[in-house]
């Protein structure tokens, strides 16, 4: 439970007071306000929203609210030279062109400045050639094409369906396969749930709807021109040829009406199996090229987008801590959207706004948190997590010394079935305890706790009677805090039923149809799921900022470390002969995990018994908890990914959205059987085991008695 000792506040100012102040009706009102026009990063509309949020956070009672600006590389379509894809005949005449924009939703016909669908950071180009269908363009899809089907993508334009993995990984894979262009499309199999109407009559994607998104492979770098350092007024910027993570081939997204026109003519090889077939009435032939009658026709891309250094604006609000003002708990989510942002990000921004209002109300009544709370409205998340990363780069010295926790607040909903939480193991017990105190919003769980409905609907695969909590991956603004700086991080939102809805994300993701009405009519008419997410996010922040002893349980890290060590050992053991030949041993890692487990257990015992009235000892114990996440950071970073420095977790090299455990060892083992120099490859596995074992042992020692 929260304790209010040492903050000199009246008993009524506890977590209950904070939670009771959160109102669904306010979240609804804020969401409406934030979604009436587009708020694309680098536009006046988004700057005005930043100033509005700054003004309102001041009114709500924060101690200070400042704008932090950076000049970063963004990407935009050419306003007078639109992007499109054509089918051309043997004479070069365009016999079919993809649409230039999405038909606007009802009520939005007169809205200006709706950016047409595009793949941000695509280079310019007009490649033409034969088409190859590459399924989801995952690593395994290209393995299937190249190794099993002997299909060469070199010099071809590939068409890939969205879903399963981050679009930037698709483009990287296509580049490595030698493709000269990429067409991304939304297949109804992934973005049209059966039995639901398309927008505006339901929450499914219409045929003219298109998913926007960046196609960078930044690996945590932030602004492509200033990796590692803030993009401020005196920044030294790389030339565009040296920029981090930019794609080298043109890329463009389309909807399934246009995709149908491209795919229906495909010839060449049949799909290798049913997992390569979507739901369109096309054969899903792989190609290359079109079938018989159309074999002389080619596909041509026309991409004219430009990369421009553009000013972006974060809003940073501060609520100073009464006792430990030099300890920061951060709640952050982005403000920029591709179009209206009905779900992404404004369902999250509206929740943050209401959390700020509630904290402000308590502050006006004389309360202060024990620790400082920082609130952030990040800019340019959609262009590669740029606002959060630049701010963290600028403030890295403060953050690494003072950062207690970061709670992310992007989309509050991606469905309305149950809770979804991804966080550091340090926060497992905090999340469990908090959700046991909150009411479930779910139908059929009236009077029951959120913990109960969540556990029932999303059970842990390992521990009975507990809910699933996932690893942090990336694709959102916690990345720099967790993966680079080693600040304990977590995120929570309401999600779909993954068992029955096997589409990727939510159907209208990053389309013009992601409106206020989508949320109000179809996802959460009473805003009860938004309120629950506000309670979870806000409750976590409250507890992290206000509990006398930090609500971190290091024993939970011990449990997962053992699980991850077992998992990576099992992967390695698929190669028993090579392990023997090259003397590969995991003994050091298992020994380090054992030591961590024992030391964490002893630390937890001391945590129960120490004198909490002694401020020096209290601060010492809290610092050991705060710095535990930091202890998993390797200053040298992961191979070829210097800004992914967490040894236990990193975004998957094959899917930025997914988290991978012991990523250094995992990547060293990946596809090792195909490496040309096995001795070198297994040497790298051994090196990565060494790094992991050392890091776990070093982290364990930070929990030992200090003297």
């Amino acid at each position: 439970k929260s304790s209010n000792e040492a903050t000199n506040i009246t008993p009524k100012h506890n977590m209950k007071a904070f939670l009771d102040e959160l109102k669904a009706e306010n979240i609804k009102k804020f969401l409406y306000n934030f979604t009436q026009i587009p708020h694309l990063a680098g536009t006046e509309q988004n700057f005005q929203l930043a100033k509005q949020i700054q003004s309102q956070w001041k009114e709500f009672g924060l101690d200070s609210v400042e704008l932090a600006h950076y000049d970063v590389l963004l990407s935009y379509p050419n306003k007078t030279h639109p992007n499109y894809i054509s089918i051309i005949n043997e004479d070069g005449n365009e016999i079919f062109n993809t649409s230039l924009f999405e038909p606007p939703p009802p009520g939005y016909e007169n809205v200006s400045d709706i950016v047409p669908p595009f793949s941000a950071f695509s280079p310019q180009g007009m490649p033409e050639g034969d088409l190859v269908y590459v399924n989801y363009a995952r690593t395994e899809d290209f393995f299937k094409l190249e190794r099993d089907m002997k299909i060469n993508c070199s010099g071809k334009i590939v068409i890939a369906r969205y879903g399963k993995v981050f679009r930037g990984n698709k483009v990287k894979n296509a580049q490595l396969a030698g493709a000269k262009g990429v067409i991304l499309y939304s297949d109804p199999a992934d973005y049209f749930a059966p039995g639901v109407k398309s927008y505006p009559d339901g929450w499914n994607l219409p045929g003219g709807g298109v998913q926007r998104g960046n196609i960078l492979n930044l690996n945590g770098a932030g602004d492509p021109l200033t990796p590692g350092y803030p993009a401020n007024e005196y920044a030294y910027r790389r030339g565009i040829a040296e920029a981090v993570g930019l794609p080298s081939i043109p890329v463009h997204p389309i909807g399934y009406y246009d995709a149908q026109k491209l795919l229906e003519k495909m010839g060449g090889s049949a799909p290798p199996d049913s997992s390569w077939r979507g739901s369109l009435k096309v054969p899903y032939n792989v190609g290359p090229g079109f079938t018989g009658n159309f074999s002389t026709q080619k596909v041509k891309m026309h991409i004219h987008s430009t990369n421009e250094v553009t000013r972006i604006y974060n809003v940073i609000g501060t609520l100073r801590g009464a006792v430990e003002p030099d300890r920061y708990v951060i709640l952050g989510g982005h403000r920029d959207s591709w179009v209206f942002g009905g779900i992404d990000p404004q369902s999250g921004a509206a929740v943050v706004h209401e959390i700020v209002r509630s904290f402000g109300t308590l502050k006006k009544e004389g309360w202060r948190p024990r620790r400082t709370i920082l609130f952030a409205s990040w800019d340019a998340e959609e262009f590669g997590l740029l606002g959060s990363t630049e701010w963290a780069e600028e403030n890295s010295r403060l953050l690494q010394e003072r950062g207690v926790a970061y709670i992310n607040a992007d989309s509050s909903i991606e469905g309305n079935y149950t809770l979804r939480v991804d966080c550091t193991p340090l926060m497992y017990s905090l999340v469990h305890n908090l959700t046991k105190e909150l009411k479930s919003p779910d139908e059929g769980f009236e009077g029951k706790s959120l913990y109960e409905s969540w556990t029932k609907k999303s059970p842990s695969p390992e521990f009975s009677g507990m809910p699933r909590i996932s690893k942090l991956g990336s694709g959102n603004d916690f990345e720099v805090f967790f993966q680079r700086l080693g600040i304990a991080s977590g995120r929570a939102r309401y999600t779909k039923n993954w068992e029955t809805n096997k589409f990727s994300g939510y159907p209208l993701y990053h389309s013009v149809y992601e409106t206020y009405e989508l949320v109000e009519k179809f996802y959460d008419p009473m805003f009860k799921y938004h309120l629950t997410v506000a309670q979870v996010r806000g409750g976590m922040v409250f507890e992290l900022a206000n509990s006398i002893v930090l609500p971190f349980d290091c024993r939970d890290y011990a449990v997962v470390l053992r699980k991850y060590a077992d998992k990576i050992y099992s992967i390695s053991m698929k190669h028993p002969q090579e392990m023997k030949t090259y003397s590969v041993s995991f003994d050091s890692l298992f020994s380090a995990v054992k030591n961590f487990t024992e030391i964490a257990s002893k630390f937890s015992e001391r945590l129960q018994d120490f004198d909490k009235s002694n401020p020096i000892v209290l601060r010492m114990m809290n610092d050991q908890l705060m710095f535990l996440e930091r202890a998993f950071i390797d200053p040298l970073g992961l191979p070829d990914r210097p800004f992914y420095r967490h040894v236990i977790y990193a975004p998957s090299s094959h899917n930025k959205y997914a988290g991978e455990s012991f990523p250094g060892i995992y990547d060293a083992l990946f596809d090792i059987e195909s490496k040309v120099d096995p001795s070198k490859a297994w040497g790298e596995v051994k090196r990565q085991i060494y790094v992991a074992a050392f890091t776990v042992q070093a982290a364990a020692e930070t929990l030992s008695e200090v003297a």
């Epitope: 694309l40 680098g42 700057f47 600006h69 000049d71 007078t80 007169n110 200006s112 400045d113 421009e308």
Partner: antibody, heavy 121, light 107 residues
Framework: EVQLVQSGAEVKKPGASVKVSCKAS????????ISWVRQAPGQGLEWMGE????????YYNEKFRGRVTLTADKSTSTAYMELRSLRSDDTAVYYC??????????????WGQGTTVTVSS | DIQMTQSPSSLSASVGDRVTITCRAS??????LNWLQQKPGKAPKRLIY???SLDSGVPSRFSGSRSGTDFTLTISSLQPEDFATYYC?????????FGGGTKVEIK
């Protein structure tokens, strides 16, 4: 408070040049551009061009290209408009106006008080 | 270049009257249109941006609307301080162009 303060009235002979200044205050100069608009006596408004000091980009109305040069001094938060080869029909009030530096903007929100340029032999 | 045809060029009205001024764009400009007010010897002042959004401090009697490429400025109840010349401005594409102006005079 946002302010754009322009230089004083000028009287010039045909063929000469004029340079009008526009000093900005009350906002971050490099977050915005400066547009220039002129208004001949008793006439309407005519856009001449704009400059974005942060990136140094300039955009001109073709009608004035080659005769007008827009510059900016970030250190003093001042924008300049120089018009060369003056003719009698260049007699007008010249205004500077602030415009947001971004992919989409709402055009001119704050205006200078105007500078009268008279071209007469 | 995009032509902006503004009408009427002048009108006489009394205090309390409802006044409507229109601008027609020669091609689609979306909602990228502002309305400006200019008083004699003064600089223009922006009243409305993006077709219908009021600038801060502008009285709510001013409103803007759009139907296709036709744009309307409405003053619901004319006040003495509203007698001025009004211009529309399109900023959808360069060069930005203004309407010819509408002079609102006292009847």
């Amino acid at each position: 408070e946002v302010q754009l303060v322009q230089s004083g009235a000028e009287v010039k002979k045909p063929g000469a040049s004029v340079k009008v200044s526009c000093k900005a205050s009350g906002y971050t100069f490099t977050s915005y551009g400066i547009s220039w608009v002129r208004q001949a006596p008793g006439q309407g408004l005519e856009w001449m061009g704009e400059i974005f000091p942060r990136r140094g980009n300039t955009y001109y109305n073709e009608k004035f290209r080659g005769r007008v040069t827009l510059t900016a001094d970030k250190s003093t938060s001042t924008a300049y408009m120089e018009l060369r080869s003056l003719r009698s029909d260049d007699t007008a009030v010249y205004y500077c106006a602030r415009v947001f530096d971004g992919y989409y903007n709402y055009a001119m929100d704050y205006w200078g008080q105007g500078t009268t340029v008279t071209v007469s032999s | 270049d995009i032509q902006m045809t503004q009408s009427p060029s002048s009108l006489s009205a009394s205090v309390g009257d409802r006044v409507t001024i229109t601008c027609r764009a020669s091609q689609d400009i979306g909602s990228s249109l502002n309305w400006l007010q200019q008083k004699p010897g003064k600089a223009p002042k922006r009243l409305i941006y993006a077709t219908s959004s009021l600038d801060s401090g502008v009285p709510s009697r001013f409103s803007g609307s759009r139907s296709g490429t036709d744009f309307t400025l409405t003053i619901s109840s004319l006040q003495p301080e509203d007698f001025a010349t009004y211009y529309c401005l399109q900023y959808a594409s360069s060069p930005y162009t203004f309407g010819g102006g509408t002079k609102v005079e006292i009847k």
